[in-house]
Every structure is written in structure tokens, then in C-alpha cells.
Interface confidence: low
Amino acid sequence: DWVVAPISVPENGKGPFPQRLNQLKSNKDRDTKIFYSITGPGADSPPEGVFAVEKETGWLLLNKPLDREEIAKYELFGHAVSENGASVEDPMNISIIVTDQNDHKPKFTQDTFRGSVLEGVLPGTSVMQVTATDEDDAIYTYNGVVAYSIHSQEPKDPHDLMFTIHRSTGTISVISSGLDREKVPEYTLTIQATDMDGDGSTTTAVAVVEILDANDNAPMF
């Protein structure tokens, strides 16, 4: 049969190049000498020359490291012709998936996030949501799965755990009672986003929470 199994290649491969991936083989080679070629994006059209084929053996070659964040799947066509140039097989689809390495850190969408909440609210009240992105894969692997955490809170009054952050959604909520604008009008939280679902690379940003007045003080004359 004129087939090749779909191929998976890790991105950022170290080589040496060219690297043999898989062998195209037509069973018509029993009857006549076969010459192999490949076409498609990554072979003879942009980005040209990423893949090649050994004309007489059918070995599919990778010529350089791949970047999944640029192109995650290549689709090439394999061709087999006899010595006189006549096609001996229909073009064959060759599917090459680029598998992910954790080569990107998370990035917060803003350096500083701002939110506000009324003083005296109950624990569990949502304040704001922060977002970080990671270009790595988050479907097949945890490389691009971001976990959020609060690194520090300033000031630490009335204590240092006034807020919590949902590890997967980035929603910041009040976790403790005692928010009092007259004492602390604003909190600065240093927040972290860590890929590998919390076990990888970390990046930080700032979340500023303004405490709004609930008009809870009687006027003084």
C-alpha cells in the first residue's frame, strides 16, 4: 500500500539535521524503480524547504527545528513516479503535527489591573478578573495551562489574607471581612501566573483594589 502514518515531531528539535522522520514507500517498487517527491507548504511552497525527501529511498527529512507557535500542523503530499516520469500512485496526504515544548512564559494582558469593591462586603464577593495568556499548547499538554496566585498584599491590614484568586479563572475575591475604606482605601496585590498548571514558569503583575465608601459613618457636627 501507498501509505504513511501521520507523524508527530517535537518543536525546537536539536537535530542533527536533516533528521529522518518516516519512509514513503510504494509497493510498485517491486515492478519498477520509483522516485519520490513531496509538495505543499513546508516543502515546495512557503515556508519552503522545511521538509524534503530522499528521492530514491523515500525517507522524509526534517531540515530544521520547528516552531509549533508559528505552524502547528503541516500537510504535505507525497508523490511516486517511475523512471520515465509517469505517476505510479495518487498523491498521498502526509499529516505532520508539531508537538509542544514549554518554550513560552505566561504573559499578563496588563501590567496593572484595577478593580474596586465596597467596604464591609461579605467574604466571597468578586472584585475583578485578571488574565494571562501563554502561547504554548493547553489542550494536549499543561504547557500553556496557567494557574493564578497572589504573591503578596500591601498593606497587610487588618491582616495579609484579605483576598484570594481563583487559580484557573483569575477571579479575585474578598476572602475576609474587615475591609474598611477609612483605614485602608487601597490594596496592592502582586499576582502571579504560572504555566504547567502551577509547576512551570512564572510571571507577575499588579492588581490594585480600591475600597469604595459605603457611607457607614454618621456625620459629626
Partner: antibody
């Protein structure tokens, strides 16, 4: 969140070129595949082609000779041109986003009806 | 091209009852990476299609857990454990293993 909006003329004359633009708002055009899909009245869905933000394209062979998909990253837009149209090209045209390497269309535009008629 | 065949063409359902749609591909959609490149979409009346299931069995964000996808290779099934009135529309399967990406002909789900 990310939204897609198709725009372009609703009526095109036979033999002319159909031109549509899809504007991506609420997110970047980078790191995704951007496709055009069409649906003739009362029929199923047909994939036209995709463009990757790095400008790699892939077209349905049934339309390849007539289709061009291009991207303008500075405007966060991608476009479809379909030349030499006939009545058979009358359809609702959707733009859609596919996650890198997964190829499932997770976000769709609302679609725009294009009629080919003189 | 990979040909996708859905059955049934039309599926009358009773709210609260289960429903099942079949999709068959003309060649295996199982990639050596271990995933089936098969997606399910629902097109509600007058709306764009929406993604329900990707890579054979993964529910898309916001999709209720009454929807589930199963199968491998060439035979796939979409199941709705308890149909609701909001589930009416045309369901499409699509193969994403290789281009041209191809859709099934659709299954119209309607309330009895």
C-alpha cells in the same frame, strides 16, 4: 471576548469577484487559523480555506483556482476573494477561528448572505 | 477527500429523553498523537454553528455536560443524555485530520 464580523456586498453579478472581510475584535489575530466556510440556502457546510497569521494558506481544491484568502494583521482582519462567481456560489458565508493545531472552529461570525445574480 | 456520513437525517426527540447521532468517516481520523480529529457542531435555527465537541470527546467551553462525544477511528457518536427544547437544530460532524476539512450532511433534531 473575541468576536468575528463579516462584511461585504450582499449582491454580486455573475463572472465578477466576491469580496468579503472578517474583522476580529476583542483579541489578536496571531496564533490562530482563520477560515471561511459557506452554506448554500437549505444545505450543509462547505469549508473554503484557511489562512494562518503567518500567511500560510490552504484552500479547498474544489475552489482553489478561484480563491484567495489574505490577512492584514495591522487591522486585525482577514479577507476572502472568490473570482468568476456563478449562481452556485450563492450562500451564507461565515468566517471562523480555529485553535492552533486543533482545527475545531471555536468562534464563528454571524454570517453574511451573498447572492449571485444579474 | 474524506467523506463524512451522518445518520439519521432527521431525529424527532422527546424532551427529557436521550438522543444519539452517528457519524462515519471514509478513513480513520485517529492521529498518531492519540487524538481523533472529529468535531461536532450545532446550528440552531437562524444562527451560526457553535462548537460542541472537539477532538472526538472534549466538550467545548460552556457546553452542558449532557452532551458527550465518543468513538474512534471511523465511527463516532454524539449523545445527548436528556434533550431540552434548546437543543433543537442541525448537528454536524466535521473531520479536521486533513484538508479539505469536510462536514457531514447534518442531522436535524426536532421536538416531537
Amino acid at each position: 471576548q473575541v468576536q468575528l464580523q463579516e462584511s461585504g456586498p450582499g449582491l454580486v453579478k455573475p463572472s465578477e469577484t466576491l469580496s468579503l472581510t472578517c474583522t476580529v475584535s476583542g483579541g489578536s489575530i496571531s496564533s490562530y487559523y482563520w477560515s471561511w466556510i459557506r452554506q448554500p440556502p437549505g444545505k450543509g457546510l462547505d469549508w473554503i480555506g484557511y489562512i494562518y497569521y503567518s500567511r500560510t494558506t490552504n484552500y479547498n481544491p474544489s475552489l482553489k483556482s478561484r480563491v484567495t484568502i489574505s490577512v492584514d494583521t495591522s487591522k486585525n482582519q482577514f479577507s476572502l476573494k472568490l473570482s468568476s462567481v456563478t449562481a452556485a456560489d450563492t450562500a451564507v458565508y461565515y468566517c471562523a477561528r480555529a485553535r492552533n493545531g486543533i482545527d475545531a472552529f471555536d468562534i464563528w461570525g454571524q454570517g453574511t448572505m451573498v447572492t449571485v445574480s444579474s | 477527500d474524506i467523506v463524512m456520513t451522518q445518520s439519521p437525517l432527521s431525529l424527532p426527540v422527546t424532551p427529557g429523553e436521550p438522543a444519539s447521532i452517528s457519524c462515519r468517516s471514509s478513513q480513520s481520523l485517529l492521529h498518531s498523537y492519540g487524538y481523533n480529529y472529529l468535531d461536532w457542531y450545532l446550528q440552531k435555527p437562524g444562527q451560526s454553528p457553535q462548537l460542541l465537541i472537539y477532538l472526538g470527546s472534549n466538550r467545548a467551553s460552556g457546553v452542558p455536560d449532557r452532551f458527550s462525544g465518543s468513538g474512534s477511528g471511523t465511527d463516532f457518536t454524539l449523545k445527548i443524555s436528556r434533550v431540552e427544547a434548546a437543543d433543537v437544530g442541525v448537528y454536524y460532524c466535521m473531520q479536521a485530520l486533513q484538508t479539505p476539512l469536510t462536514f457531514g450532511g447534518g442531522t436535524k433534531v426536532e421536538i416531537k
